[in-house]
């Protein structure tokens, strides 16, 4: 059922990376517009993206209020130019999204190696602590602030002349690894949340190699 020429949204999908969270859906509207509502399981519905012809809605501002909550969204369809019109049951046509818990489900963004410094046969590799849109006391929190020790980084490192990748892990943003003196090494990092069963890993960071500008060398 529903208003003539109005179709319900479908394929509602959460797209979320480092808590930047967008709800996407289909179809592209023909003579209709959409409004999105979002709520926690126990909360009130809040409307966003009013009467839009887009098929996405940025819900980041809502979910960052409490990333450990579980959210539900719904997309209402209205005839273009007649947004007061309702379906046969006296309500606008709408479709519910899957539930979404940002803390458990947001994808981990590609990390970046901030710097590496060699001192003798040790190299300190530092991973950039990316800022998120999650706030506390009016300041934006970093990924480490939000996830704490739940977030680990895996470092892959290898001699420039070799293919075998050694690994190291840290629950901070720094690695201290042993290297052979006089050898150049390359590095790549991956963010991991081991307690998860889905969306556990980020993509790998860009590879950085010794002898390039990010590094420092000290005897």
């Amino acid at each position: 059922s529903g208003t003539t020429n109005t179709v319900a949204a479908y394929n509602l999908t959460w797209k979320s990376t480092n808590f930047k969270t967008i709800l996407e859906w289909e179809p592209k509207p023909v003579n209709q517009v959409y409004t999105v509502q979002i709520s926690t399981k126990s909360g009130d519905w809040k409307s966003k993206c009013f009467y839009t012809t887009d098929t996405e809605c940025d819900l980041t501002d809502e979910i960052v209020k409490d990333v450990k909550q579980t959210y539900l969204a719904r997309v209402f369809s209205y005839p273009a130019g007649n947004v007061e019109s309702t379906g046969s049951a006296g309500e606008p046509l709408y479709e519910n999204s899957p539930e979404f818990t940002p803390y458990l489900e947001t994808n981990l963004g590609q990390p970046t190696i901030q710097s590496f410094e060699q001192v003798g046969t040790k190299v300190n590799v530092t991973v950039e602590d990316e800022r998120t849109l999650v706030r506390r006391n009016n300041t934006f929190l970093s990924l480490r602030d939000v996830f704490g020790k739940d977030l680990i980084y895996t470092l892959y490192y290898w001699k420039s002349s070799s293919s075998g990748k050694k690994t190291a892990k840290t629950n901070t943003n720094e690695f201290l690894i042993d290297v052979d003196k006089g050898e150049n090494y390359c590095f790549s990092v991956q963010a991991v949340i081991p307690s998860r069963t889905v969306n556990r890993k980020s993509t790998d960071s860009p590879v950085e190699c010794m002898g390039q500008e990010k590094g420092e060398f000290r005897e």
Epitope: I152, K165, K169, N171, V198, R200, K201, D204
Partner: antibody
Framework: EVQLVESGGDLVRPGGSLRLSCAAS????????IHWVRQAPGKGLEWVGY????????YYADSVKGRFTISADTSKNTAYLQMNSLRAEDTAVYYC?????????????WGQGTLVTVSS | DIQMTQSPSSLSASVGDRVTITCRAS??????VAWYQQKPGKAPKLLIY???FLYSGVPSRFSGSRSGTDFTLTISSLQPEDFATYYC?????????FGQGTKVEIK
């Protein structure tokens, strides 16, 4: 339920080749690291190598480097150990094991093992 | 590579005995040490991770401790099902390495 099942073990002549499989169920291998570990008859555990199926990165023990290759097919949720130029000292039960990539990351889950015998 | 030197290689004990097995790492491995139990014809089973944390489902008579680069597995009161071979493993760096194993036999 997390399960790892190895297969492909056989009797093979020195210099021969063999491919072992490690079929995973109950989890997605690309989210984890898969290791191969072997145990010669009456001996201890020896680490062979690992693969991170998400990026294809590998590392091998010196004793097998250049002869063994680990690969993974994420569509089949299976890791492989290709063994070439086999020697008598490669005779062992071969296990695959899952590493959850946590900081503590021990080998939490192991397969039942598959026996490789290299003999003329 | 980091060497894990495990001792003793074998020991004989009776049910109810307190058993201690040690592993010494050739260099610092922080707490990245695990202990496994293996019975004949079976795959190893994880007992202890991060040097002292008991893995889920493992009886509390098993415990692990660390002192610098020395790691200890203790079985407070040996039970009949504990007769097996025990291995330590470091996973602080690649390659991960195992101790030589300790076979716990019935006296």
């Amino acid at each position: 339920e997390v399960q790892l099942v190895e297969s492909g073990g056989d009797l093979v002549r020195p210099g021969g080749s063999l491919r072992l499989s490690c079929a995973a169920s109950g989890f997605t291998i690309s989210y984890y690291i898969i290791h191969w570990v072997r145990q010669a008859p009456g001996k201890g555990l020896e680490w062979v190598g690992y693969i991170d199926p998400s990026n294809g990165y590998t590392y091998y023990a010196d004793s097998v480097k250049g002869r063994f290759t680990i690969s993974a097919d994420t569509s089949k949720n299976t890791a492989y150990l290709q063994m070439n130029s086999l020697r008598a000292e490669d005779t062992a039960v071969y296990y695959c094991a899952r590493d959850d990539q946590s900081v503590s990351s021990p080998f939490e889950y192991w397969g039942q093992g598959t026996l490789v015998t290299v003999s003329s | 590579d980091i060497q894990m030197t495990q001792s003793p290689s074998s020991l004989s004990a009776s049910v109810g005995d307190r058993v201690t097995i040690t592993c010494r790492a050739s260099q610092d491995v922080n707490t990245a040490v695990a202990w496994y139990q293996q019975k004949p014809g079976k795959a190893p089973k994880l007992l202890i991770y991060s040097a002292s944390f008991l893995y889920s489902g493992v009886p509390s008579r098993f415990s692990g401790s660390r002192s610098g680069t020395d790691f200890t597995l203790t079985i407070s009161s040996l039970q009949p099902e504990d007769f097996a071979t025990y291995y330590c493993q470091q996973h602080y760096t690649t390659p991960p390495t195992f101790g030589q194993g300790t076979k716990v036999e019935i006296k």
